[in-house]
């Protein structure tokens, strides 16, 4: 059972355990060609140097070939995500060869030993690929290695060792422990394939990071900042999933990378977009929703190859389950003045009304404090497609930054009982859609009434002349 020392307890224990005396087992890597979408079908086992299974099992030399590479295992069995991914690949690419790399005996070890085995497994995959290259019509460019956790680094080794260049490697939350900060030849890196794309879903800057934090591909995508995944909180996990411990929260977040990739295969009509940004905080502020100069990309299988980029960090928000797609909006709110604000920090809430649907009331996350007489940028996202935005309802509440400030507020109120109400003055809201890249300006419905008190609402409609307002003297900051 998990140790009480946080969600990473078991793995932390594994990292510091003395090496156990193990019985000698045959080091084995097997290649199972999944010949059916049916997860119960045993498939075909390919054998290096034996062409008969290729013919018997209908290996298509001219088609795409996917190699799925699992990670470290505590149970010694294939995890449940595996046949989901197999099935999704078969659904999307009907003629493709889907090969599961079975290195369970070498992965069902102490974590440190499994890490040491990744090189051997990578070498086995490279040898299999070298052999396949000897066949007519087989192209390494059609090979896509998909590695989860420790399997992502196995894929890196395979790409490094193979004669030639693999078409693509997708790293699904590559393992962090013993790889963070490692030399490029000892972990997944952009040199390992023509295109290396990576999804990071369990990274932590404190404690043990199960997934690697550093960028290791041509594009590195950090859904929800790469750390806390929606639907994986302890409450969600206890309530609705086949898990019941903090350890399973870790599993949920780590495995989310696989499900995001599966989603990109099966929900092709609902692609999720990620946006290039220097860090998660800037993304949360909403200043990174640009698609200019290849700054945005689809995630997962639909990602566009950007060979020229290296270690391009990209971010997005997602839903808690499939389809994961959300709709991102940048909101620029110019706060012209505070009135009697004291030490109170405002929290804004918006409701978006569109041609297709209306949003719920959405809080605007404050990354830094609200600036007066300045344009403040926020990120909001909706789970449904609202269509073209028509109007926005804005409210705000005062949220004290500390108990001390709350006390000061209360004291101030008691000493000045006739203190006039607190107000903010907001005349317009500028909105940019991440998905459509459309920019719109929304003006206060009543230009003479642009002050708003806590709990009251202010309505904004599309300004008649688009992005800029007439007679607007304050400078506008161009969207990135």
């Amino acid at each position: 059972s998990p140790t009480p020392f946080g969600p990473e307890g078991q793995l932390a224990d594994e990292l510091h355990k003395p090496k156990a005396i193990q019985t000698e087992v045959k080091p084995s890597v097997r290649f199972n060609l999944r010949t059916s979408k049916d997860p119960e079908h045993e498939g075909c086992y390919l054998s290096l140097g034996h062409s008969q299974p290729l013919e018997d099992c209908g290996f298509n030399m001219t088609a795409k070939t996917f190699f799925i590479i699992h990670g470290w295992t505590m149970s010694g069995i294939f995890e449940n995500w595996l046949h989901k991914l197999v099935s999704a690949l078969h659904t999307r690419e009907k003629d493709a060869n889907v090969v599961v790399v079975d290195w369970l005996p070498l992965a069902h070890q102490l974590y440190t030993d499994a890490v040491n085995n990744t090189r051997v497994v990578g070498h086995s995959i490279a040898r299999m690929l070298d052999w396949l290259q000897e066949k007519d019509d087989f192209s390494l460019g059609n090979v896509h290695l998909i590695g989860y956790s420790l399997g992502a680094h196995v894929a890196g080794y395979a790409g490094n060792f193979v004669k030639g260049t693999v078409g693509r490697i997708t790293g699904l939350d590559p393992a962090g422990p013993m790889f963070e900060g490692a030399d490029i030849h000892k972990r997944l890196s952009p040199d390992d394939a023509d295109f290396v794309d990576v999804l990071h879903t369990y990274t932590r800057s404190f404690g043990l990071s199960i997934g690697i934090q550093m960028p290791v591909g041509h594009i590195d995508i950090y859904p929800n900042g790469g750390d806390f995944q929606p639907g994986c909180g302890l409450n969600d996990v206890l309530g609705s999933m086949a898990y019941g411990t903090i350890t399973e929260v870790v599993k949920c977040e780590h495995e989310r990378a696989v499900h995001l990739f599966v989603d990109s295969l099966v929900n092709q009509d609902k692609p999720s977009f990620a946006f290039q940004c220097t860090d998660s905080n800037r993304f949360k502020k909403g200043i990174c929703l640009s698609c200019r100069k290849n700054r945005c990309n689809s995630i997962g299988y639909n990602a566009k190859k950007m060979r020229n980029k290296r270690n391009s960090k990209m971010y997005l928000k997602t839903r808690a389950g499939m389809p994961f797609r959300v709709y991102h909006y940048q909101m620029k709110i110019h706060v012209f003045s505070y009135k009697n604000m004291g030490e109170i920090e405002p929290t804004f809430y918006v409701t978006l009304y569109g041609t297709n649907a209306d949003s719920q009331t959405l809080p605007l996350e404050i990354v830094e404090r609200i600036e007066q007489n300045a344009t403040n940028t926020f990120l909001v996202y909706t789970e449904e497609d609202l269509g073209d935005l028509l109007k926005i309802q804005l409210t705000w509440e005062g949220a004290s930054q500390s108990w001390y400030n709350l006390w000061k507020e209360l004291r101030s109120y008691l000493s000045q009982p006739h203190n006039p109400g607190r107000e903010l003055n907001i005349r317009r809201i500028r909105v940019k859609s991440g998905e459509t890249q459309r920019k719109l300006t929304f003006c206060a419905e009543d230009p003479e009434n642009t002050s708003i008190s806590p709990g009251r609402e202010l309505w904004f409609r599309k300004c008649r002349d688009g992005w800029r307002m007439k007679n607007e003297t304050s400078p506008t900051v161009e969207l990135p």
Epitope: E40, H41, P105, A242
Partner: antibody, heavy 120, light 111 residues
Framework: QVQLVQSGSELKKPGASVKVSCKAS????????MNWVRQAPGQGLEWMGW????????TYAGDFKGRFVFSLDTSVSTAYLQISSLKAEDTAVYYC?????????????WGKGTTVTVSS | DIVLTQSPASLAVSPGQRATITCKAS??????????MHWYQQKPGQPPKLLIY???NLASGVPARFSGSGSGTDFTLTINPVEANDTANYYC?????????FGGGTKVEIK
Amino acid sequence: QVQLVQSGSELKKPGASVKVSCKASGYTFTNYGMNWVRQAPGQGLEWMGWINTYSGVPTYAGDFKGRFVFSLDTSVSTAYLQISSLKAEDTAVYYCARRGYYGRRYFDVWGKGTTVTVSS
Amino acid sequence: DIVLTQSPASLAVSPGQRATITCKASQSVDYDVDSYMHWYQQKPGQPPKLLIYAASNLASGVPARFSGSGSGTDFTLTINPVEANDTANYYCQQTIEDPPTFGGGTKVEIK
């Protein structure tokens, strides 16, 4: 057809050892894991563990660590269960059952069972 | 470990009637749209036989009188109509995680 043939009933004294065999036919032995399940008289089914028939790596359930050993002879497609230091409470029917490596891993083929009786 | 609780412990049914057995798991055995719950029949002196896999799929050679349903933590095995040779113990099993566990069994007798 696919079948698992187990060795015959055993009568043993406490402290002795027993080795039960399970011979597979009709399928590729190494393509499926082999489970061992115990059923004490009048009781339900209890999973003892399984062995990866390709690598030979065994996995034991909590109550079956120590005196119980799973092994293989892949040349004759046979799995073995050995129990040492037998106790009266080991009296049961022992079944081997195969499960796939992929998919939902249910037990689709069972041996007829081997009755092990431990009595002084 | 996931605990499976079967009810009733025993059941007496007349031929031609419906028999219903339920199995409740201590936590969900669903993974995405799949349920990792299976049902076995064990007749006296015989090994268990797979009846239903993944909650509702009929195993090869099993008559359509047997059906399974449910998701999450609650599952049902139905025999309709019951026949004389359905006298047996019936077990549910989960395989979403190791160790795979079995329910305590339901004894079905034909009146």
